[in-house]
């Protein structure tokens, strides 16, 4: 009688991550007695999968029973597959001895290669906001996947970003890789809507790739241009002396009036108007009854926006081409919550 | 018990080969691979490959390959390591341990033998 | 290759005291390592397997632990026969490859 093989059909087996992996393995001969084992790999460090004579493999069933005294089919299954599974299985047949049974034969092994999506991309920012022209850099990470190949690009508002560079670890053989990516972005003052997209393509999701995305909105810092402007109102002894302040993000901004270099008010942006950009402009302004002066006033616009140091814009207040009233050195303070008369 | 006898001491000429043995008993010979180690005078340990006696099967290290040569008599549950174009850099003390005929934590390098001390000089 | 950097490579300790060895995994070995233990006659014998087990009639102030990718031999209470050398090996991935080695010598 021709000697026992053991045959592996399958050369590869591709399984996807939480599926069942059918490794098949069948014997040409009952003869010699023995079992049957299952190894993940080869040499002294191989992996015992299962084995028929005894032992407690949870993971592991038989696709046919195996105490049926002519059964020569020693297929087993797998379930629940990750990718630390991924690797070549060998079906072997040892012959009963005595003390220990003794290996008689091997299969040729079959190759179980694992597939796994990739995690959900995660972009994250720099730390600090930045103003418009610098340069920001943004990391884009997903993890888990198997095979290696992957595929990643990143995108300001639909438009393909070409200055970045990316890793995908470890550089050898591995269960499942990770990649990060870093991309540099210059930024515009019209970038508070803009969104910065890394996109990840596998063969496991089957070309509909994930998307990270991060908002621009919480990278950039416009910072605001003032304007000090005048012009009469009410009584000829009172000027309205507006600041405006405008194209800022974000909202987050604290004005101070200086009257000749003395705080006079400050005040927290409240009720601020937006632009279509996203950026915000809001005014502020103040009652100045010019009697109450003998010199030329100073007054000073002083903002500071999101922590930043202030920036101010001055207007001198030619008292000398304003009437006099005598004797009106008080003024009462208007109760309007952007205004304020100054004496 | 399990125990490895290993052959004795060489003192061997540049350019030539020893073999050396390690002679196993207490245990199933078939059921285990035999790896070798060297250890240079005062320094560490190397793996140097192993042997599985069912087939014949052998793994080396990669800088001992060509260098080493492993075999078994199954018969005799002995082991044999020959080194080949001696140089100064083999003398050495060169140890067999074992390990399962899988990766089963408790078996690995348990038993080693005493060390054959191989010394290369003109 | 994995390599194994053993830490310290000397060490002069007294009777008593409390020590540890380590050795740090250039990549995942999971917990397949071992310490093994070097008399000056060039035995060898092994202590600790997968980590953490200790081998049977090894004392038991003998303790092996790990974090991330460091082991640690951890001997509590040296006693005169434990100044020999200690090696770390890794069974994890051909080739095995051992630690430099720790010499435990007495203070």
């Known amino acids: 009688e021709e000697e026992l093989q053991v045959i592996q059909p399958d050369k590869f087996v591709l399984v996807a991550a939480g599926e069942t992996a059918t490794l098949r393995c069948t014997a040409t001969s009952l003869i010699p007695v023995g079992p049957i084992q299952w190894f993940r790999g080869a040499g002294p460090g191989r992996e015992l999968i299962y084995n028929q004579k005894e032992g407690h493999f949870p993971r592991v069933t038989t696709v046919s029973d195996l105490t049926k005294r002519n059964n020569m089919d020693f297929s087993i299954r797998i379930g629940n597959i990750t990718p630390a599974d991924a690797g070549t299985y060998y079906c072997v047949k040892f012959r009963k001895g005595s003390p220990d049974d003794v290996e008689f034969k091997s299969g040729a092994g079959t190759e179980l290669s694992v597939r796994a999506k990739p995690s959900a991309p995660v972009v994250s920012g720099p730390a600090a906001r930045a103003t418009p022209q610098h340069t920001v850099s943004f990391t884009c990470e997903s993890h888990g996947f198997s095979p290696r190949d992957i595929t990643l690009k990143w995108f300001k508002n639909g438009n393909e970003l070409s200055d970045f560079q990316t890793n995908v670890d470890p550089v050898g053989e591995s269960v499942s890789y990770s990649i990060h990516s870093t991309a540099k972005v210059v930024l515009t003052r019209e970038d508070v809507h803009s969104q910065v997209i890394c996109e990840v393509a596998h063969v496991t999701l089957q070309g509909d790739p994930l998307r990270g995305t991060a908002n621009l909105s919480e990278t950039i810092r416009v910072p605001p241009t003032l304007e000090v402007t005048q012009q009469p109102v009410r009584a000829e002894n009172q000027v309205n002396v507006t600041c405006q302040v405008r194209k800022f993000y974000p909202q987050r901004l604290q004005l101070t009036w200086l009257e000749n270099g003395n705080v006079s008010r400050t005040e927290t942006a409240s009720t601020v108007t937006e632009n279509k950009d996203g950026t915000y402009n809001w005014m502020s302004w103040l009652l100045v009854n010019v009697s109450a002066h003998r010199d030329d006033v100073k007054l000073t616009c002083q903002v500071e926006h999101d922590g930043q140091p202030a920036v101010s814009k001055s207007h001198d207040l030619k008292v000398s081409a304003h009437p006099k009233e005598q004797g009106s050195n008080t003024a009462a303070e208007n109760t309007g919550s952007n205004e304020r008369n100054i004496y | 018990e399990v125990q490895f006898q290993q052959s004795g001491t060489v003192l061997a000429r540049p350019g030539t080969s020893v073999k050396m043995s390690c002679k196993a008993s207490?245990?199933?010979?078939?059921?285990?691979?035999m790896h070798w180690v060297k250890q240079g005078p005062g320094q560490g340990l190397q793996w140097i490959g192993a042997?599985?006696?069912?087939?014949?099967?052998?793994t080396y290290n990669q800088k001992f390959k060509g260098k080493a040569e492993l075999t078994v008599v199954t018969s005799t549950s002995t082991a044999y390591m020959e080194v080949s174009s001696l140089t100064n850099e083999d003398s050495a003390v060169y140890y067999c341990?074992?390990?399962?005929?899988?990766?089963?934590?408790?078996?690995?390098?348990?038993?080693w033998g005493q060390g054959t001390l191989v010394t290369v000089s003109a | 290759d994995i390599q194994m950097t053993q830490s310290p490579s000397s060490l002069s300790a007294s009777l008593g005291e409390r020590v540890s060895l380590t050795c740090r995994a250039s990549?995942?070995?999971?917990?397949?390592l071992n310490w093994l233990q070097q008399e000056p006659d060039g035995t060898i014998k092994r202590l600790i397997y997968?980590?953490?087990s200790l081998d049977s009639g090894v004392p038991k102030r003998f303790s092996g632990s790990r974090s991330g990718s460091d082991y640690s031999l951890t001997i509590s209470g040296l006693e005169s026969e434990d100044f020999v050398d200690y090696y770390c090996?890794?069974?994890?991935?051909?080739?095995?490859?051992f630690g430099g080695g720790t010499k435990l010598e007495i203070n």
């Open positions: 341990t074992r390990s399962f005929y899988y990766s089963l934590d408790a078996a690995w390098f348990v038993y």
């Open positions: 207490g245990s199933t010979f078939t059921s285990y691979w």
């Open positions: 042997i599985y006696p069912v087939n014949n099967d052998t």
């Open positions: 990549q995942d070995i999971g917990s397949r």
């Open positions: 997968a980590t953490s």
């Open positions: 090996l890794q069974y994890a991935s051909s080739p095995f490859t």
